[in-house]
């Protein structure tokens, strides 16, 4: 089954610094999202090989890419306190496939010592309702019907 390997699990950086998030898959993608999770999840970027990437206006001019959609490194620059959050890669294939998430902690420089990442990956409760790293049928189909549909190949 398709998987998304995402790293790092967590990173603590001072205001104004940069962070790299890497999303790796076994290939066969149509594209990949980086999304910031929360009550109103937000698309940060959509990357597709051979196409100019699309970036949310909040991050426009602050994001660089290297690699390909199968092994993509996203660099977010000039981080602000409001950028703190959990970011997850979503691979677009025939099913939904998620990375495990990256918790980015942006801190004032003087408070660096108070906010540190542990080595554990982000808690599952901080990620979307679907189990992380798993392949799921199209959730819109599932949510629109009284009974979840059987898993099927989607376009």
């Amino acid at each position: 089954a398709q998987e998304v390997q995402q790293s790092p699990h967590c990173t603590t950086v001072p205001v104004g610094a940069s962070v790299n998030i890497t999303c790796s898959t076994s290939g066969g993608l149509r594209g990949i999202y980086l999304r910031q999770l929360g009550p109103q999840p937000q698309d940060i970027i959509y990357y597709e090989d051979g196409v100019v990437p699309t970036t949310d206006r909040r991050f426009r001019g602050r994001i660089d890419f290297s690699g390909s959609q199968d092994n993509l490194t996203i660099t977010m620059h000039r981080l602000q306190l409001s950028d703190t959050g959990t970011y997850t890669c979503q691979a677009i294939t025939e099913v939904n496939v998620y990375g495990s998430g990256t918790l980015v902690l942006v801190t004032e420089e003087q408070s660096q010592g108070w906010h540190r990442c542990s080595d554990a990956p982000p808690r599952a409760s901080a990620l979307p309702a679907p189990p992380t790293g798993s392949a799921l049928p199209d959730p819109q189909t599932a949510s629109a019907l009284p009974d979840p549909p059987a898993a099927s190949a989607l376009p």
Partner: nanobody, 116 residues
Framework: QVQLQESGGGLVQPGGSLRLSCAAS????????MGWYRQAPGKQRELVAT???????YYVDSVKGRFTISRDNAKKTVVLQMNNLEPEDAAVYYC??????????WGQGTQVTVSS
């Protein structure tokens, strides 16, 4: 406020054509993988065609070679051109974001009837 407005359905004979259109607003359309779904009476809603922000298209086997999906990011519209329609294509057609987990808004759909 998210809005999806489908139009263009109707009654057509087998072998005929229809052009469905969807106007979207309330989200960043240019970043969205968009899809056309359909639901026939008593059946599950199925995703029949998708188009990525970059314009790459994908189709379920049953419509390949007959349906064409396209998009206009400036106008925030997505179109499904349906040719050589078959009775099995009859359904209510909806457009929406595809492969999304945090999004559950639907338009009213547009009815496609294929009958002689």
């Amino acid at each position: 406020q998210v809005q999806l407005q489908e139009s263009g359905g109707g009654l057509v004979q087998p072998g005929g054509s229809l052009r469905l259109s969807c106007a979207a607003s309330g989200f960043t359309f240019s970043m969205a993988v968009m899809g056309w779904y359909r639901q026939a009476p008593g059946k599950q809603r199925e995703l029949v065609a998708t188009i990525t922000p970059g314009g790459n298209t994908y189709y379920v086997d049953s419509v390949k070679g007959r349906f064409t999906i396209s998009r206009d990011n400036a106008k925030k519209t997505v179109v499904l051109q349906m040719n050589n329609l078959e009775p099995e294509d009859a359904a209510v057609y909806y457009c929406n974001r595809a492969y999304d987990t945090h999004y559950d808004y639907w338009g009213q759909g547009t009815q496609v009837t294929v009958s002689s």
